[in-house]
């Protein structure tokens, strides 16, 4: 038995460009906390697989409010260590996930809101009883600096916390068959009595009275080689008598790693690198159940209790992801129409509508053409939050109720005189100009700069604007 200890040193922007925005603001103060998840072996650190070695949550850090305009600094951290107790042996190799969570402390409806800021993961080899190991991990633009160690709880000692120690009976040496607990410790390994007759060379025990066999040996006392055949077997053991040189089976022969795991030989055993979703010494364990508490942020877990059945997290409003770990910025979907301002209140969305619009999403135009008529043959056109009338010729105003003076805008160029006409206006052009608006000069030789005037109209005649 023992304790894994994690000390967070700093959490802040990593080096390089693209510094992250501070997660807290004057409007929305927040504080950080951390979660660590440990798994045995060197399997993939799938965030979804359970924390078989244990997990721990830190205290909340100090409340932090961003200084306007300042870059995100290293954020204030919770006090103390994260401690993950382990009951059995320390595995020596382990995977970790460290999550940095933000707790928002603004005027939240229904309590504080949590969101995952960063998640780092890794695989490490660590002997219990060793010094603090320092590490730096990056997640996006964030950088996490931390140290960790594993220590045994007395009377357990050793790199796996499996040996029990007691003071030496003699000053210089331990009893027969016992070794020092560590080269410099003044204690000896306590004797562990295995099953009577258990092979001292090929068997061992972790509990009194048992006899567990080392690789290549079997039988109740571990005295029987797994392969007793001679060199006729392609994987048979070496035989000094026949001069056979075929090596015995390796630990990865036949691939002991299940579920597509890959095997590599270690100095005395083997190691499985497991595909995502599997873990365990041989990648034999799969699936996550609701018993593992995989849903964050108040998500409701639905699923069977057996390892083979999947689980589903039903997320509360404002959260998403397979584990409800992601805070949804629902305003990013721009749900408010017609330029309305979106407000995410956590429990609900609110749209603040511009003048002239209404409805939950500002979808209703208050000044639309419904029930409104444009007089004198005008047609109603919607747009911009207000209706307008496109008036028939000779009429104007908001509802086309006013008679228009077609000459008010002085449409005839070059001193031409304007006459109102029932079908519009007529320009009487000054000498030397022609065209519907008297816009074209007439050349001195009488030739027009344009194609000849329509039949029946001479230069200088009033031009009717149709």
């Amino acid at each position: 038995a023992g304790v894994f200890e994690l000390q967070i040193h700093s959490f802040g922007p990593g080096p390089g460009p693209g510094a992250p925005r501070s997660p807290c603001s004057a409007r929305l103060p927040c504080r950080l906390f951390f979660r660590v998840c440990l798994k045995p072996g060197l399997s993939e650190e799938a965030a979804e697989s359970p924390c078989a070695l244990g997990a721990a949550l830190s205290a909340r850090g100090p409340v932090y409010t961003e200084q306007p305009g300042a870059p995100a600094p290293d954020l204030p951290l919770p006090d103390g260590l994260l401690q993950v107790p382990f009951r059995d042996a320390w595995p020596g190799t382990f995977s970790f996930i460290i999550e940095t969570w933000r707790e928002e402390l603004g005027d939240q409806i229904g309590g504080p809101a949590w969101s995952l800021l960063a998640r780092v993961a890794g695989r490490r080899r660590l002997a219990a009883g060793g010094p603090w190991a320092r590490d730096i991990q990056r997640a996006g633009a964030w950088e996490l600096r931390f140290s960790y160690r594993a220590r045994c709880e007395p009377p357990a000692v050793g790199t796996a916390c499996t040996r029990l120690c007691r003071p030496r009976s003699a000053p210089s040496r331990c009893g027969p068959g016992l070794r020092p607990c560590a080269p410099l410790e003044d204690e000896c390994e306590a004797p562990l009595v295995c099953r009577a007759g258990c092979s001292p060379e090929h068997g061992f025990c972790e509990q009194p009275g048992e006899c567990r066999c080392l690789e290549g040996w079997t039988g109740p006392l571990c005295t029987v080689p797994v392969s007793t055949s001679s060199c006729l077997s392609p994987r048979g053991p070496s035989s000094a008598t026949t001069g056979c040189l075929v090596p015995g089976p390796g630990p990865c022969d036949g691939n002991p790693c299940a579920n597509g795991g890959s095997c590599s030989e270690t100095p005395r055993s083997f190691e499985c690198t497991c595909p995502r979703g599997f873990y365990g010494l041989r990648c034999e364990v799969s699936g996550v159940t609701c018993a593992d508490g995989p849903c964050f942020n108040g998500g409701l877990c639905v699923g069977g209790a057996d390892p083979d059945s999947a689980y589903i997290c039903h997320c509360p409003p404002g959260f998403q992801g397979s584990n409800c770990e992601k805070r949804v910025d629902r305003c990013s979907l721009q749900p408010c129409r017609n330029g309305g301002l979106c407000l995410d209140l956590g429990h609900a969305l609110r749209c603040r509508c511009r003048a002239g619009f209404a409805g939950p999403r500002c979808e209703h135009d208050l000044d639309d053409c419904a029930g409104r008529a444009c007089a004198n043959g005008g047609t109603c056109v919607e747009g911009g939050g207000a209706h307008r009338c496109s008036c028939a010729l000779g009429f104007g105003g908001r509802d086309c109720r006013e008679r228009a003076d077609p000459c008010a805008a002085r449409p005839c160029a070059h001193g031409g005189r304007c006459y109102a006409h029932f079908s519009g206006l007529v320009c009487a052009c000054a000498p030397g100009y022609m065209g519907a608006r008297c816009e074209f000069p007439v050349h001195p030789d009488g030739a027009s700069a344009l194609p000849a005037a329509p039949p029946g109209l001479r230069p200088g005649d009033p031009q009717r604007y149709l």
Epitope: G92, R125, L126, A160, E201, L214, P267, E271
Partner: antibody, heavy 124, light 106 residues
Framework: QITLKESGPTLVKPTQTLTLTCTFS??????????VGWIRQPPGKALEWLAH???????RYSPSLKSRLTITKDTSKNQVVLTMTNMDPVDTATYYC????????????????WGQGTLVTVSS | DIQMTQSPSSLSASVGDRVTITCSAS?????MYWYQQKPGKAPKLLIY???NLASGVPSRFSGSGSGTDFTLTISSLQPEDFATYYC?????????FGQGTKLEIK
């Protein structure tokens, strides 16, 4: 005092089998946590691990040479024997044996004592 | 296979200098082991389990690192330190050594 000494032929012909013996004193391969390994070093080149054997007869071989290597121990004689078949001139090297210690099930603590080495030349 | 890359491959320094040799593994190895070898001699263990000094090794030698990047430091070079240094990993088979760093007198 812990010592290790390699012995075997200094010259072997191509295709022949090399048998090297490591004789050690000051520790026993019947003691839990003890192992003996073989390492070689071609002239002017880096070290290359070949194989090792533990007190409980767990063995490891370099994958690239596995089909040619066999390691055995004789606990009563304090000896470890390495056999390498089908020798080739590229196998010319100084061959070392060394003690390996593991105070944990699968973590090597140290390869702390080495023999003086024996130069093996492969030539016809 | 885990490749071990030492840098520099060779290094000239003077007595009293502080020297750093790095070893980079192609994948995480967690522990590193360092050896010193002089011409015509067997390698000698210097550092085991990354930072532990082997018996009889002077305290001017130190080891550090984690994951894939490890360092051997000699705080103040002595005449007897001029040799070739090797790193090694015991994580997975084959248990590979670095190509060596030759430390020479400037």
């Amino acid at each position: 005092q812990i010592t290790l000494k390699e012995s075997g032929p200094t010259l072997v012909k191509p295709t022949q089998t090399l048998t090297l013996t490591c004789t050690f004193s000051g520790f026993s391969l019947s003691t839990s946590g003890m192992g003996v390994g073989w390492i070689r070093q071609p002239p002017g080149k880096a070290l290359e691990w070949l194989a090792h054997i533990w007190w409980d007869d767990v063995k490891r071989y370099s994958p690239s040479l596995k089909s040619r290597l066999t390691i055995t121990k004789d606990t009563s004689k304090n000896q470890v024997v390495l056999t390498m078949t089908n020798m080739d001139p590229v196998d010319t090297a100084t061959y070392y044996c060394a003690r390996i210690v593991s105070f944990d099930n699968d973590v090597v603590s140290a390869m702390d004592y080495w023999g003086q080495g024996t130069l093996v030349t492969v030539s016809s | 296979d885990i490749q071990m890359t030492q840098s520099p491959s060779s290094l000239s320094a003077s007595v009293g200098d502080r020297v750093t040799i790095t070893c980079s593994a192609s994948s995480s190895v967690s522990y590193m082991y360092w050896y010193q070898q002089k011409p015509g001699k067997a390698p000698k263990l210097l550092i085991y389990l990354t930072h532990n000094l082997a018996s009889g090794v002077p305290s001017r030698f130190s080891g550090s690192g984690s994951g894939t990047d490890f360092t051997l430091t000699i705080s103040s070079l002595q005449p007897e330190d001029f040799a070739t240094y090797y790193c090694q990993q015991w994580r997975s088979n084959p248990f590979t050594f670095g190509q060596g760093t030759k430390l020479e007198i400037k």
